[in-house]
C-alpha cells in the first residue's frame, strides 16, 4: 500500500492524481490557491463546513509564490509554527489571521517569512513517523483576535475524544475542489487497534487515527494543520488513504503528545 501525504505540492507531487490508484495512501499536502492544478488531488477537508470566523486564530497557511497554499500549519508560540515535516520547502511564506483561501487582503492577516525550518530528526521521507517540523518566523506575531498561539497537549488522546481539524484542503476526492474559506470538521479519535487494523504495519506511537463513519476526513492540502481536542493542540494532519474519506480508512495524524519535550527544547535552543 502506498501512502497519501496530505500536502498540496504542485512542484514535486509524490503521486500526481492521475497516477495514484484507488486504495493507496498519500501525504495530505496540496497545491491550492490561485494556481491550483485541476488534476492535483493533494489537499482537503471532506464533508466539513465553513469554520466560524476568528475561531481558529492559530491556523496558518504555508504558501509557495505567488499565492499557492501547499500546507497548513499551527501557531504554537509567538514566533514558532508547527507543521508536518513532509511540508518542508526551502522558500515559502506564512499567512496567519486569514479566513479565505484567495489572496485577497483581510484586515486581520499577518504575513511572515520562515527563517528556520527544523524537521524532527527522526522523520524519514517518504515515511510518516515523526512527521512534524518547527518553523521560526522572521518576527513575533502581533496577538489579535485573529492571530494567537495554541498550547500543545502533553496528554495523549484517548479513543472517543472529540476533536476539530481545520484546513483549506480540497473538499472532494478524488476530484479536486478547493473551498472558498477555512473548513472545520469534527472528528473522533479512534483506538490504536482500529488504527492499526486500518493500516497494518504502518502505524506507530507517533501517529493516531481519527475520523467518523459518515465520510468525513482531512485530505491533501490540509497537511500540517491542527487537530484540536479539549482546547489544546493534539495532532497535525499527516497522511491517509486515497481517495480521502473512504470507509474504514481514517485520517492519520502526528501524535504531538510524544513530542512536547522536543518542541520545547528546540524552541528554547533556537530562540
Amino acid at each position: 500500500v502506498t501512502e497519501h501525504v496530505l500536502a498540496n505540492n504542485d512542484v514535486s507531487c509524490d503521486h500526481p492524481s492521475n497516477t495514484v490508484p484507488s486504495g493507496s495512501n498519500q501525504d495530505l499536502g496540496a497545491g491550492a490557491g490561485e494556481d491550483a492544478r485541476s488534476d492535483d488531488s493533494s489537499s482537503r477537508i471532506i464533508n466539513g463546513s465553513d469554520c466560524d470566523m476568528h475561531t481558529q486564530p492559530w491556523q496558518a497557511a504555508l504558501l509557495l509564490r505567488p499565492n499557492q497554499l501547499y500546507c497548513g500549519a499551527v501557531l504554537v508560540h509567538p514566533q514558532w509554527l508547527l507543521t508536518a515535516a513532509h511540508c518542508r520547502k526551502k522558500v515559502f511564506r506564512v499567512r496567519l489571521g486569514h479566513y479565505s483561501l484567495s489572496p485577497v487582503y483581510e484586515s486581520g492577516q499577518q504575513m511572515f517569512q520562515g527563517v528556520k525550518s527544523i524537521p524532527h530528526p527522526g522523520y524519514s521521507h517518504p515515511g510518516h513517523s515523526n512527521d512534524l517540523m518547527l518553523i521560526k518566523l522572521n518576527r513575533r506575531i502581533r496577538p489579535t483576535k485573529d492571530v494567537r498561539p495554541i498550547n500543545v497537549s502533553s496528554h495523549c488522546p484517548s479513543a472517543g475524544t472529540k476533536c476539530l481539524v481545520s484546513g483549506w484542503g480540497t473538499t472532494k476526492s478524488p476530484q479536486v475542489h478547493f473551498p472558498k474559506v477555512l473548513q472545520c470538521l469534527n472528528i473522533s479519535v479512534l483506538s490504536q487497534k482500529r488504527c492499526e487494523d486500518a493500516y497494518p504495519r504502518q502505524i506507530d506511537d507517533t501517529m493516531f487515527c481519527a475520523g467518523d463513519k459518515a465520510g468525513r476526513d482531512s485530505c491533501q492540502g490540509d497537511s500540517g494543520g491542527p487537530v484540536v481536542c479539549n482546547g489544546s493542540l493534539q495532532g497535525l494532519v499527516s497522511w491517509g488513504d486515497y481517495p480521502c474519506a473512504r470507509p474504514n480508512r481514517p485520517g492519520v495524524y502526528t501524535n504531538l503528545c510524544k513530542f512536547t519535550k522536543w518542541i520545547q527544547e528546540t524552541i528554547q535552543a533556537n530562540s
Epitope: V11, S12, L64, R65, A85, R88, K89, K90, V91, Q113, V115, K116, I118, P119, H120, P121, G122, Y123, S124, H125, P126, N138, N270
Partner: antibody, heavy 117, light 110 residues
Framework: EVQLQESGPGLVKPSGTLSLTCAVS????????MSWVRQPPGKGLEWIGD???????DYASWAKGRVTISVDSSKTQVSLKLSSVTAADTAVYYC???????????WGQGTLVTVSS | AYQMTQSPSSLSASVGDRVTITCQAS??????LAWYQQKPGKAPKLLIY???TLASGVPSRFSGSGSGTDFTLTISSLQPEDFATYYC????????????FGGGTKVEIK
C-alpha cells in the same frame, strides 16, 4: 532557458576583496533560494552561503564576517563579496539554484579566481 | 556541528559493475540529503535529493537510500559516462555549519 552565469575578476591580490556576480535568467529570483559554492583546485566542494528571496542569508561558519551575499535591486543578479582574501581562497566559484527541496538543480559554469600578488 | 563523511574517497570499477558510495552525517539529518556528480572541468549535476528522489533527467540506474545518519548512492550498472566524482550534501540545517558537502568519492576505471 534557465541559466546562471558567474562573472568577475580572475585575479585578486592578497588582502583584497573578491567580487563576483551571478546573472540569473529564465526564472524569477523571488521564487528560489540561491547558493554560492566554491572548489579549490583539486579539492572538493565547499558551501559558502545561501540567500533567500526574503533577503535572509545563511553563511558557512568560516565565512561569517568575511562574506557578503546580496541580490541587486533589479532582482536579476546575485553577488558575492569575500574580503581579506589569501591564497587559500583560490578556487572555482559557482552560484547555484535550490530546487526548493534542498537540492541544487541549476549551476553556473563556474569562474576561477586566483589570489596572487 | 554537522559533518558529512563520504567513503570511500576513491574506488576503481568496471563498466557494468554495481557501485555503492556511502555518506555519513555526524548527527541525524533526517532525509535532507542530495547527491551530485561532477566531471573534470564541469559544474556539479544534481542526481538525487530528499535522499531517494531522482532529479529530472537522471537515469534510473542511479538510486539513493537511507535516513538519519547513513546514506547510500548506488549505481546499478556502471556506464562509461558515470566515471566522475560524487558528492553528498546535507540540507537539514545551515546553522553553525563549516561545510554542507561531503569530501567526495572519485569513481575511476579499473
Amino acid at each position: 532557458e534557465v541559466q546562471l552565469q558567474e562573472s568577475g575578476p580572475g585575479l585578486v591580490k592578497p588582502s583584497g576583496t573578491l567580487s563576483l556576480t551571478c546573472a540569473v535568467s529564465g526564472f524569477p529570483l523571488s521564487n528560489y533560494a540561491m547558493s554560492w559554492v566554491r572548489q579549490p583546485p583539486g579539492k572538493g566542494l565547499e558551501w559558502i552561503g545561501d540567500i533567500y528571496p526574503s533577503d535572509i542569508i545563511d553563511y558557512a561558519s568560516w565565512a561569517k564576517g568575511r562574506v557578503t551575499i546580496s541580490v541587486d535591486s533589479s532582482k536579476t543578479q546575485v553577488s558575492l563579496k569575500l574580503s581579506s582574501v589569501t591564497a587559500a581562497d583560490t578556487a572555482v566559484y559557482y552560484c547555484a539554484r535550490d530546487n526548493n527541496d534542498y537540492g541544487l538543480d541549476i549551476w553556473g559554469q563556474g569562474t576561477l579566481v586566483t589570489v596572487s600578488s | 556541528a554537522y559533518q558529512m563523511t563520504q567513503s570511500p574517497s576513491s574506488l576503481s570499477a568496471s563498466v557494468g559493475d554495481r557501485v555503492t558510495i556511502t555518506c555519513q552525517a555526524s548527527q541525524s539529518i533526517s532525509s535532507w540529503l542530495a547527491w551530485y556528480q561532477q566531471k573534470p572541468g564541469k559544474a556539479p549535476k544534481l542526481l538525487i535529493y530528499l535522499a531517494s528522489t531522482l532529479a529530472s533527467g537522471v537515469p534510473s540506474r542511479f538510486s539513493g537510500s537511507g535516513s538519519g545518519t547513513d546514506f547510500t548512492l548506488t549505481i546499478s550498472s556502471l556506464q562509461p559516462e558515470d566515471f566522475a566524482t560524487y558528492y553528498c550534501q546535507q540540507g537539514y540545517t545551515n546553522s553553525n555549519i563549516i561545510n554542507t558537502f561531503g569530501g567526495g568519492t572519485k569513481v575511476e576505471i579499473k
